[in-house]
Interface confidence: low
């Protein structure tokens, strides 16, 4: 099938960085400035992404690959291709429509991004709170009260915090 296609379709010979120009008898023409084709056999070149405003250029566009953006200082990327930039906040805060706000009591955020998450509920795992939570840190769970017999010295690792963005089920 591939062989037949290349015999019948001269466009299949056009490499990445070019396009098959129908206006010029299907010759392979280089992509115009600010455009690219990342695969061969393309009939058009794609427009390069422009990193404007809060976006800044991490990698320039070339004839064979799109530009890549990241975010200016004080902002961080969201999404797999950095399709969004969001303002950083401090630890212990989350970004709301009205800007950075402190985490409510009972929640924490240990990063400059993301949302405040509920403290781990140690009692769900039959454990007790060893270290209280703060706006910036989750609680640390320790052994259950029953395990705290004289001579017991081992401390159970803390139960994992819930995934970001979710209230307890």
């Amino acid at each position: 099938f591939e062989r037949t296609r290349s015999l019948q379709d001269p466009c299949s010979n056009c490499p990445a960085g070019t396009f098959c120009d129908n206006n010029r008898n299907q010759i392979c023409s280089p992509c115009p400035p600010n455009s690219f084709s990342s695969a061969g056999g393309q009939r058009t070149c794609d427009i390069c992404r422009q990193c404007k405003g809060v976006f800044r250029t991490r990698k320039e566009c070339s004839s064979t690959s799109n530009a890549e953006c990241d975010c200016t200082p004080g902002f961080h990327c969201l999404g797999a291709g950095c399709s969004m930039c969001e303002q950083d906040c401090k630890q212990g805060q989350e970004l709301t429509k009205k800007g950075c706000k402190d985490c409510c009591f009972g929640t924490f955020n240990d990063q400059k991004r993301g949302i405040c998450r509920p403290w781990t509920n140690c009692s769900l795992d039959g454990k007790s709170v060893l270290v209280n939570g703060t706006k910036e840190r989750d609680v640390v769970c320790g052994p259950s009260p029953a395990d705290l017999s004289p001579g017991a010295s081992s401390v159970t690792p803390p139960a994992p915090a819930r995934e970001p963005g979710h209230s307890p089920q």
Epitope: L78, G79, A80, G81, K97, Q111, E163, S167
Partner: antibody, heavy 119, light 107 residues
Framework: QVQLVQSGAEVKKPGASVKASCKAS????????IHWVRQAPGQGLEWMGR????????EYAQKFQGRVTMTRDTSTSTVYMELSSLRSEDTAVYYC????????????WGQGTSVTVSS | DIQMTQSPSSVSASVGDRVTITCKAS??????LSWYQQKPGKAPKLLIY???RKVDGVPSRFSGSGSGTDFTLTISSLQPEDFATYYC?????????FGGGTKLEIK
């Protein structure tokens, strides 16, 4: 560029299992979540669950609990979704989509894997 | 589970019209709501997240608003390429749930 390329269409008999794959390129899958969303013919979107490729941990919608398993192979940047005990209601297009570590930002999607369950 | 009720389920409009789609959550979801556009045979496309934040490249005619349980997607002046189905999604808690969809058709 960011791309999610999914495996091809499948036709299965009731009671069988299907395993769809989703190969990522253009980004590090360990920086994101991969979600699976399905859409029955002419119907709306239904979130099935997500996997954190960095840890392998996953969360599933209760509706699919016990029937769905999401796994990953970080060496090939591929995520898999296996659905067992198939029934005709599972006929749908299954999409993989990337999220973000702190948000359900399903901002890049695979082309979908069509699964038909028919006797 | 958090139910998302979207209305209307379909709407006919003309190019240049202003269109509003609403989504109501069965419980407050803070600002964890996004909107998707889907065209026939294609994967959905993220337009707006966290209620009102537009994805890079989404035209300014699209806007989102609301809080708590009631949310709105507005298209200020419909263009031919906007005719599609729109879905809201809550992502406060598992399982994430989509609204039933709103099919926007040409009048």
């Amino acid at each position: 560029q960011v791309q999610l390329v999914q495996s091809g269409a499948e036709v299965k008999k009731p009671g069988a299992s299907v395993k769809a794959s989703c190969k990522a390129s253009g980004f590090n899958i360990q920086d994101t979540y991969i979600h699976w969303v399905r859409q029955a013919p002419g119907q709306g979107l239904e979130w099935m669950g997500r996997i954190d490729p960095a840890s392998g941990n996953s969360e599933y919608a209760q509706k699919f609990q016990g029937r769905v398993t999401m796994t990953r192979d970080t060496s090939t940047s591929t995520v898999y979704m296996e659905l067992s005990s198939l029934r005709s209601e599972d006929t749908a297009v299954y999409y993989c989509t990337t999220g973000n570590l702190h948000y359900a930002l399903m901002d890049y999607w695979g082309q979908g894997t069509s699964v038909t369950v028919s006797s | 589970d958090i139910q998302m009720t979207q209305s209307p389920s379909s709407v006919s409009a003309s190019v240049g019209d202003r269109v509003t789609i609403t989504c109501k959550a069965s419980q407050p979801i803070n600002t964890y709501l996004s909107w998707y556009q889907q065209k026939p045979g294609k994967a959905p496309k993220l337009l707006i997240y966290r209620v009102n934040r537009k994805v890079d490249g989404v035209p300014s005619r699209f806007s989102g608003s609301g809080s708590g349980t009631d949310f709105t997607l507005t298209i200020s002046s419909l263009q031919p390429e906007d005719f599609a189905t729109y879905y809201c999604l809550q992502y406060l808690d598992f399982p994430y749930t989509f609204g039933g969809g709103t099919k926007l058709e040409i009048k």
